[in-house]
């Protein structure tokens, strides 16, 4: 009687049981009463990571500069490519199938916490008593320079874009 | 070759739930992911949502309460589910290969219309 | 919610045209946009990604440019095979990936 079901790694074709063909194998023809199922390589840049039962298999990912990606793994016959982002650039979800160009912390916000390759920039705008003047992906708030300790008055107040202006004490005249 | 395909109804009644589904060929669903796009007619188009290729799914914020995107590895099959259909869900809907990303590969879409 | 703003809606242009189409973003994406260009009946087709980068087998009429919220699709010389709808895309993160409304050319 013909099998209704088969084996793991088997397949049921014409009312009957054939080897599926392994990882980094493409199938040529299923098995039949007398021959086994024939399987072929992966050709160079393909593979398959299953047991299977395709007739092609499958290009290797293609890590696009033009999205911010490049070769973290090559490909095997078995495996596909594993891509990641460009240094400066981080993947736009956790499957990271694109990246984009880390963001930069404007004027009057500093960074909070500086990107990784899997998260973007935070910034956080600067307190009162602190500013940054640059758009940067790196640099913090910088504290309003005191004026005191160099002996000198505030002439011009600061922002959360610019530093004070610091100059000298008027002296009282005799 | 590489393909992605949309099939299912063509015609829906208003409340019901559209199911689509998406065949995709040349490529692991393991490697890459898959987004659902419509266009309702003379319009523009807008995103739906995604499956990642690690298998998270990702919905527009509008459409959350209303779909799910789900995978079969197997069977190189995403499927749409899209509840409490309406006529304004008039659209043709577009499966696409990438999940959170560009989409170079689409299918031809398919019409699906929403009337009692 | 993030949105997308394209415009114009829609523009007259004539053979040997340099068109310009642009698209802003409500808040930074970085250089996480790209443009389609789509045809009756058929579906889009990419042309630009990273903001500035040609897709595969693209002219070299067609440039992007732009980063941050503020973006630009230019053709430098508009052919009769140009003239189509063109959408920019957003895919900076999961909760800003987003079409914008579109933009038609048409003939003159």
């Known amino acids: 009687e013909p099998p209704t079901a088969c084996r793991e790694k088997q397949y049921l074709i014409n009312s009957q049981c054939c080897s599926l063909c392994q990882p980094g194998q493409k199938l040529v023809s299923d098995c039949t009463e007398f021959t086994e199922t024939e399987c072929l390589p992966c050709g160079e840049s393909e593979f398959l990571d299953t047991w299977n039962r395709e007739t092609h298999c499958h290009q290797h990912k293609y890590c696009d500069p033009n999205l911010g990606l490049r070769v973290q793994q090559k490909g095997t016959s078995e495996t596909d490519t594993i891509c990641t982002c460009e240094e400066g650039w981080h993947c736009t979800s956790e499957a990271c199938e694109s990246c984009v160009l880390h963001r930069s912390c404007s004027p009057g916000f500093g960074v909070k916490q500086i990107a990784t390759g899997v998260s973007d920039t935070i910034c956080e705008p600067c307190p009162v008593g602190f500013f940054s003047n640059v758009s940067s992906a790196f640099e913090k708030c910088h504290p309003w320079t005191s004026c005191e300790t160099k002996d000198l008055v505030v002439q011009q107040a600061g922002t959360n874009k610019t530093d004070v202006v610091c100059g000298p004490q008027d002296r009282l005249r005799a | 070759e590489v393909t992605v395909k949309e099939s299912g109804p063509v015609l829906v009644k208003p409340t019901e739930t559209l199911t689509l589904t998406c065949t995709v060929s040349?490529?692991?669903?393991?490697?890459?992911?898959v987004s659902w796009i419509r266009q309702p007619p003379g319009k523009a188009l807008e995103w739906l949502g995604g499956i990642g290729s690690d298998g998270s799914a990702y919905y527009a914020s509008w459409a959350k309460s209303r779909l799910t995107i789900s995978r079969d590895t197997n069977l190189k099959q995403v499927v749409l589910t899209m509840t409490n259909m309406d006529p304004v869900d008039t659209a043709t809907y577009y499966c696409?290969?990438?999940?959170?990303?560009?989409?170079?590969?689409w299918g031809q879409g398919t019409l699906v219309t929403v009337s009692s | 919610a993030f949105q997308l703003t394209q415009s114009p809606s829609s523009l007259s242009a004539s053979v040997g045209d340099r068109v310009t189409i642009t698209c802003q973003a409500s808040q930074s994406i970085s250089t996480g946009l790209a443009w389609y260009q789509q045809k009756p009946g058929k579906p889009p087709k990419l042309l630009i990604v990273?903001?500035?980068n040609l897709a595969s087998g693209v002219p070299s009429r067609f440039s992007g440019s732009g980063s941050g919220t503020d973006f630009t699709l230019t053709i430098s010389s508009l052919q009769p095979e140009d003239f189509a709808t063109y959408y920019c895309?957003?895919?900076?993160?999961?909760?800003?990936?987003?079409f914008g409304g579109g933009t038609k050319v048409e003939i003159k």
């Open positions: 895309q957003s895919y900076f993160s999961s909760s800003s990936t987003v």
């Open positions: 990273g903001a500035s």
């Open positions: 040349g490529f692991s669903l393991s490697s890459y992911g």
């Open positions: 696409a290969r990438g999940g959170i990303t560009v989409y170079a590969m």
